[in-house]
């Protein structure tokens, strides 16, 4: 028997957040915050002995949750 169609959302795509579009989802504290409380990290200088800089879709710093801790800047998707 054939399977039904796959979900339209890719397996690795971020799930919709409970935030209204005016806010962003802080993955660390797992709730919505003003987007200005999330901070995009500055890439490390070239040649620095560290992993590649994180992209905007990967965990990044959150001023609201304490600098250096993980957060995802997911604008509200309602």
């Amino acid at each position: 028997m054939r399977r039904g169609p796959r979900s339209l959302r890719g397996r690795d795509a971020p799930a919709p957040t409970p935030c209204v579009p005016a806010e962003c989802f802080d993955l660390l504290v797992r709730h919505c915050v003003a987007c200005g409380l999330l901070r995009t990290p500055r890439p490390k200088p070239a040649g620095a002995s560290s992993p590649a800089p994180r992209t905007a879709l990967q965990p990044q710093e959150s001023v609201g949750a304490g600098a250096g801790e993980a957060a995802l800047p997911l604008p509200g998707l309602l």
Epitope: P18, A22, E23, H31, G36, L37, T40, P73
Partner: antibody, heavy 118, light 113 residues
């Protein structure tokens, strides 16, 4: 038709408490956060705070000017939002608006007037 | 707190004229995660409650006439009315929702010459 209707305003004395209500209809209230904003006569708008939706556990944010004195809450049906104001001061005299909050402050009520005077 | 500064505070115009008003924020309202500016414009007519005109600095709210245009990025924003109508006479407020507390400008009052 979208409707936000505030009520509960009036004349009170300094130090008194007052509770304002905002009844919402005509849109999916559960999708929205709800704000309270005030406007003293002839002056600019001031944001007081908001309450998030059910999906966010009705969490709140407040302006420093009212934090600890004012409390925003929602009823179980989510269609009514309250602003509980304690220890009122003369400078709290204003028209109080409730607004929905999604892309910005999308819908506004007509406002209810609060006068704090002895 | 982010301070929103609007200029001019009042503006005398004739019907049919093009009008621009300015809003400046004390810090950038551009969120690099989505390249959106967290700025809105509202119109408040005498004796009425405010009405949302523009959000994300340049997105017109549904039902708002296309003579209203929002532009700008970062800290400098402009609301333009391409051809003023008598019904546009009002106070216009900008507001940031980039961070708490949400803050409004003092408004620009549009009056008839």
């Amino acid at each position: 038709e979208v409707k936000l209707v505030e009520s509960g305003g009036g004349l009170v004395q300094p130090g008194d408490s007052l509770s304002l209500s905002c009844a919402a209809s005509g849109f999916t209230v559960t999708d929205y956060y709800m704000n309270w904003v005030r406007q003293p006569p002839g002056k600019a708008l001031e944001w007081l705070g908001f309450i998030r939706n059910k999906a966010n556990g009705y969490t709140t944010e407040y302006s420093a000017s009212v934090k600890g004195r004012f409390t925003i809450s929602r009823d179980i049906s989510q269609t009514i939002v309250y602003l509980q104001m304690n220890a009122l001061r003369a400078e709290d005299s204003a028209t109080y608006f409730c607004t929905s909050y999604k892309n910005a402050m999308d819908y506004w009520g007509q406002g209810t007037s609060v006068t704090v005077s002895s | 707190d982010i301070v929103m500064s609007q200029s001019p505070s009042s503006l005398a115009v004739s019907v049919g004229e093009k009008v621009t008003m300015s809003c400046k924020s004390s810090q950038s309202l551009l969120y690099s995660g989505n390249q959106k500016n967290y700025l809105a414009w509202y119109q408040q007519k005498p004796g009425q409650s405010p009405k949302l005109l523009i959000y994300w600095a340049s997105t017109r709210e549904s039902g708002v006439p296309d003579r209203f245009t929002g532009s700008g990025s970062g800290t400098d924003f402009t609301l333009t009315i391409s051809s003023v109508k008598a019904e546009d006479l009002a106070v216009y407020y900008c507001q940031q929702y980039y961070t708490y507390p949400l803050t409004f400008g003092a408004g620009t009052k549009l009056e008839l010459k």
